[in-house]
Interface confidence: medium
């Protein structure tokens, strides 16, 4: 979690002098409670916005907006603490709006917003706005919280953000998987415009179960520049295991911008509706790493060679 780096953060508006400060998420009013405290925010809204840094990079940000209740407690409102909690890591980041002048009633409801918390694709956050000073221990809460789910890099607007592009979001492999026979799957996909290797993980599952009954990893060496954007096909050899008929193929690229952490794409082949009569099983090729010269990665119990071609 971080704040967008560009320009000084502003919270002033007509009729209010205000400054944005970094916060430890532990306002002084927790430690030294006040007798008179403001009511809670009203109508907290969080939306996905996009903002450029000074360097021109585009990032998704949480646009936080709320209004004040129309009661006399605004006379005791000294500011607000904005807190963003990333739910999967428990990481929290806070900023504080510090009012330098007292709020007065005016015809229109007071409205505040802040758009500088950078959020990550596919992550969920809890956004809290606390009015300051915070209430005394037994006082009514004066904060409002909302959860906010950021779309992942599949989302059209997200796809072109810097974090998504860095993880390979612009690459659409358009995977097709075809069952050639009971022993072989053919995987076709489009290569990206980078000379980097790919890994294909085949995971097979029983019909209605989610524990895998077979895995095999296949390595595809880096394509040459003339093969960029071309279709590549790989034939994967399956193990003839009982009921192990649903196959998920996942392609992991290793682009320079994301290395081991690039977006993976997958496709699934379902079990046949009516199982065919089993065909005779050909002799298995070695499970072992070959003693000489194969460049293929052999993963758990690969019983046959996988081979690949690039098409122009």
């Amino acid at each position: 979690l971080r704040l967008l780096d560009h320009r000084a953060l502003v919270c002033s508006q007509p009729g209010l002098n205000c400054t944005v400060k970094n916060s430890t998420c532990l306002d002084d009013s927790w430690i030294h409670p006040r007798n008179l405290t403001p009511s809670s925010p009203k109508d907290l809204q969080i939306q996905l916005h996009f903002a450029h840094t000074q360097q021109g990079d585009l990032f998704p940000v949480a646009h936080i907006e709320w209004t004040l209740q129309t009661d006399a407690s605004i006379l005791y409102l000294e500011g607000a603490e904005l807190s963003v909690l990333q739910l999967n890591t428990n990481e929290r980041l806070c900023v504080k709006f510090q009012f330098l002048s007292m709020l007065q009633h005016h015809r229109k409801r007071w409205r505040f917003s802040f758009s500088h918390f950078v959020v990550d694709p596919g992550q969920e956050y809890e956004v809290t706005v606390h009015h300051l000073p915070k209430p005394i221990p037994d006082g009514d809460p004066n904060h409002q919280s909302k959860n906010f789910l950021v779309p992942d890099c599949e989302h059209a607007r997200m796809k072109v953000t810097t974090p998504c592009m860095s993880s390979g979001s612009l690459w659409d492999p358009n995977i097709t998987v075809e069952t050639l026979d009971t022993q072989h799957l053919r995987v076709d996909f489009t290569l990206w415009n980078e000379s980097t290797h790919y890994q294909i993980l085949l995971t097979s599952f029983p019909h209605m179960e989610n524990h895998s009954c077979f895995e095999h990893m296949h390595h595809i060496p880096a394509p040459r520049p003339e093969e960029f954007h071309q279709r590549s096909n790989v034939t994967l050899t399956l193990r003839n295991l009982k009921g192990c008929c649903r196959h998920q193929v996942q392609i992991q690229p290793f682009f320079s911008s994301c290395l081991n952490d690039c977006l993976r794409h997958s496709a699934t082949v379902s079990c046949p509706e009516m199982p065919d009569t089993p065909e005779p099983i050909p002799d298995y090729m070695p499970l072992w790493e070959p003693r000489s010269g194969s460049s293929d990665y052999k993963d758990d119990d690969d019983k046959g060679s996988s081979h690949h071609h690039h098409h122009h």
């Epitope: 524990h211 077979f214 895995e215 002799d283 499970l287 072992w288 993963d299 758990d300």
Partner: antibody
Framework: QVQLVQSGAEVKKPGASVKVSCKAS????????ISWVRQAPGQGLEWMGW????????NYAQKLQGRVTMTTDTSTSTAYMELRSLRSDDTAVYYC?????????WGQGTLVTVSS | EIVMTQSPATLSVSPGERATLSCRAS??????LAWFQQKPGQAPRPLIY???TRATGVPARFSGSGSGTDFTLTISSLQSEDFAVYYC?????????FGGGTKVEIK
């Protein structure tokens, strides 16, 4: 050369937990899954389960479901097997082995004794 | 689960003789069968996989045969280092299961 080196012998009380480690070397760790097999004193071999070092997928023996957890740490090429709510009949030598279906390399074994 | 039954439980053989070990599956396991050798205080050692393929470094006197439900491990001429317990294991279906073992001892 391929090696699987396991942690040392453990003595545990009934109801306790044990966590056995298995450090792999001599090959690319994420290329092969790790299976766990145990052998009670004077008895045969019993398959406990398997973990994919690449995807984290697991497959556990039905009788151990809910008591066993297999994990890996790819940064140290180490697999772990934790067994909870230990009973006296869990006393055994615990082996890690490479691969999912057929085991081509084995660790030296870790003796876990469960006794009050 | 598939039950693997090995026979005999103990086989007494003289060095230089031929030893034939049997393994039967409660249902067909195709050719998805392995054999292991285990000596006291040691981890199992892989001998045969896919019913008949010798593992790396395994001497030619060890051979495996069979498919479906009946499998055989043959040691053509027993050496002193071959006296051990032998296990078969099926990997055609989950859970993976081992036979109870055959102890090959010196006659």
């Amino acid at each position: 050369q391929v090696q699987l080196v396991q942690s040392g012998a453990e003595v545990k009380k009934p109801g306790a937990s044990v966590k056995v480690s298995c450090k792999a070397s001599g090959y690319t760790f994420t290329r092969y899954g790790i299976s766990w097999v145990r052998q009670a004193p004077g008895q045969g071999l019993e398959w406990m389960g398997w973990i994919s070092t690449y995807s984290g997928n697991t497959n556990y023996a039905q009788k151990l479901q809910g008591r066993v957890t297999m994990t890996t740490d790819t940064s140290t090429s180490t697999a772990y097997m934790e067994l909870r709510s230990l009973r006296s009949d869990d006393t055994a030598v615990y082996y890690c082995a490479r691969r999912q279906l057929y085991f081509d390399y084995w660790g030296q074994g870790t003796l876990v004794t469960v006794s009050s | 689960e598939i039950v693997m039954t090995q026979s005999p439980a103990t086989l007494s053989v003289s060095p230089g003789e031929r030893a034939t070990l049997s393994c039967r599956a409660s249902q067909s396991v195709s050719s998805n069968l392995a054999w292991f050798q285990q000596k006291p205080g040691q981890a199992p050692r892989p001998l045969i996989y896919d019913a008949s393929t010798r593992a790396t470094g395994v001497p030619a006197r060890f051979s495996g045969s069979g498919s479906g439900t009946d499998f055989t491990l043959t040691i053509s001429s027993l050496q002193s280092e071959d006296f051990a317990v032998y296990y078969c294991q099926q990997y055609d279906n989950w859970p993976l299961t081992f036979g109870g073992g055959t102890k090959v001892e010196i006659k």
